[in-house]
Amino acid sequence: QPEQKASNLIGTYRHVDRATGQVLTCDKCPAGTYVSEHCTNTSLRVCSSCPVGTFTRHENGIEKCHDCSQPCPWPMIEKLPCAALTDRECTCPPGMFQSNATCAPHTVCPVGWGVRKKGTETEDVRCKQCARGTFSDVPSSVMKCKAYTDCLSQNLVVIKPGTKETDNVCGTLPSFSSSTSPSPGTAIFPRPEHMETHEVPSSTYVPKGMNSTESNSSASVRPKVLSSIQEGTVPDNTSSARGKEDVNKTLPNLQVVNHQQGPHHRHILKLLPSMEATGGEKSSTPIKGPKRGHPRQNLHKHFDINEH
């Protein structure tokens, strides 16, 4: 229904009357409408609702509403529908995040690793290796490392110490004479490999594929996460050049990429879920920071002086 009434607070725009050449100041139309007839010396402008498939976000003096962005490509879903007041906005479904306007599944942290930061619709999950006293026995994109069962609190002893991948195994001690009784203290310590980690802050990665072969050897690379890229470690007795070589031997699917970070270059080991052929399960584009906001927000390149 065309609307002629002007609000007191509404802005104005200038319009040149084609018949007279006169510059007129007209009231803008509200968001969700457009100017179907400009004002004249004797009449107010006329506003009409944006037709289906078009929108105007703000009060305006434009003669045609903007076309909505095209439908969201699968598997994206509509975050905001195309309506008179809003453009269509697309986002990735739960369990996926947006990268270069495509959706990639959230990384699954392998056994021995837990979620450090939950994934969102714009950022991947960040994994971290389970710290001493914690473990993760299932690959997951949502679960954190869990604390070992406290055997002593249940009046039990640790029969088998936990690792990054397994919980403590609790049990009762058979009655021994005091001379042969094992010391419970020694049983509670995890394996030495589990107690020490060596960090080299410059080696960074995101899990790629993480199939059984890779995850078995992933203990040599411990993610501590920066942005959506995960930071790892290699033994500190290797030189940086040698370190790169060794990590690549251990994890053959690592890709080495250069990544500018601050004033200096950082060396990044990028680990993505296997995308052997498609390049699409994880975006094959260079790593960028997570894209924020609606990918099409700048696509209406025409700037209309009568809008806003």
């Epitope: 490509p73 699968w74 739960p94 993480m210």
Partner: antibody, heavy 116, light 113 residues
């Protein structure tokens, strides 16, 4: 080696049921969209169904909606297709396939024959 | 639903010659936000599962010989085999993955003349 292996096909009477399985190995199964695609004798490829990595979302072709159910068990690295109320036109080789921006890994297929 | 139409239905080409297969979608599969065409090409040999050749309309899948190339944008796409080899005898399918249901073209059978 990345592999998908289907099983569960066979001969079934119209109105009957069958459950297909697809065992995945060599990749992080829980990280991928998985689909079923079929090919009827002498016909082209037809997409049947897709399931999201977590299993939380599923979609079906109109031709099977309400009769087929796709599911997955990420702990067992296995994809399933439960087929009920089978019809003669469901006779086909059924493939499971990995991926959403192009299906990059396919199983060898399992044959389903619906006939009285 | 997006309909995919392939032409020709079959094609006989001499060894070493160029083979061209066309695919037309009933609506655009180009997403302007990332400038990607949501289209794939597959090769399907008798007795084998289909094999992904091309994704994003023009990106070759890993391990695919460079005699295979994909081109086109929007609604019109082409798969080209620059120099046909005996092992290329197969049925070729295009597939859109822009929207559900995912749809395939009817297939083009490539034979040796």
């Amino acid at each position: 080696e990345v592999q998908l292996l289907e099983s569960g096909g066979g001969l079934v009477q119209p109105g009957g049921s069958l459950r297909l399985s697809c065992a995945a190995s060599g990749f992080t199964f829980s990280q991928y969209m998985m689909s079923w695609v079929r090919q009827a004798p002498g016909k082209g490829l037809e997409w049947v169904s897709v399931i999201y990595p977590s299993g939380g979302s599923t979609h079906y072709a109109d031709s099977v909606k309400g009769r087929f159910t796709i599911s997955r068990d990420n702990s067992k690295n296995t994809l399933y297709l439960q087929m009920n109320s089978l019809r003669a036109e469901d006779t086909a080789v059924y493939y499971c396939a990995r991926g959403h921006y192009g299906m990059d890994v396919w199983g060898q297929g399992t044959t389903v024959t619906v006939s009285s | 639903d997006i309909q995919m139409t392939q032409s020709p239905d079959s094609l006989a080409v001499s060894l070493g010659e160029r083979a061209t297969i066309n695919c037309k979608s009933s609506q655009s599969v180009l997403y302007s936000s990332n400038n990607k065409n949501y289209l794939a090409w597959y090769q399907h040999k008798a007795g084998q599962p289909p094999k992904l050749l091309i994704h994003w309309a023009s990106s070759r899948a890993s391990g695919v010989p460079d005699r295979f190339s994909g081109s086109g944008s929007g609604t019109d796409f082409t798969l080209t085999i620059s120099s046909l080899q005996a092992e290329d005898v197969a049925v070729y399918y295009c597939q859109q993955f822009y929207s559900l249901p995912l749809t395939f073209g009817g297939g083009t059978k490539v034979e040796i003349r």
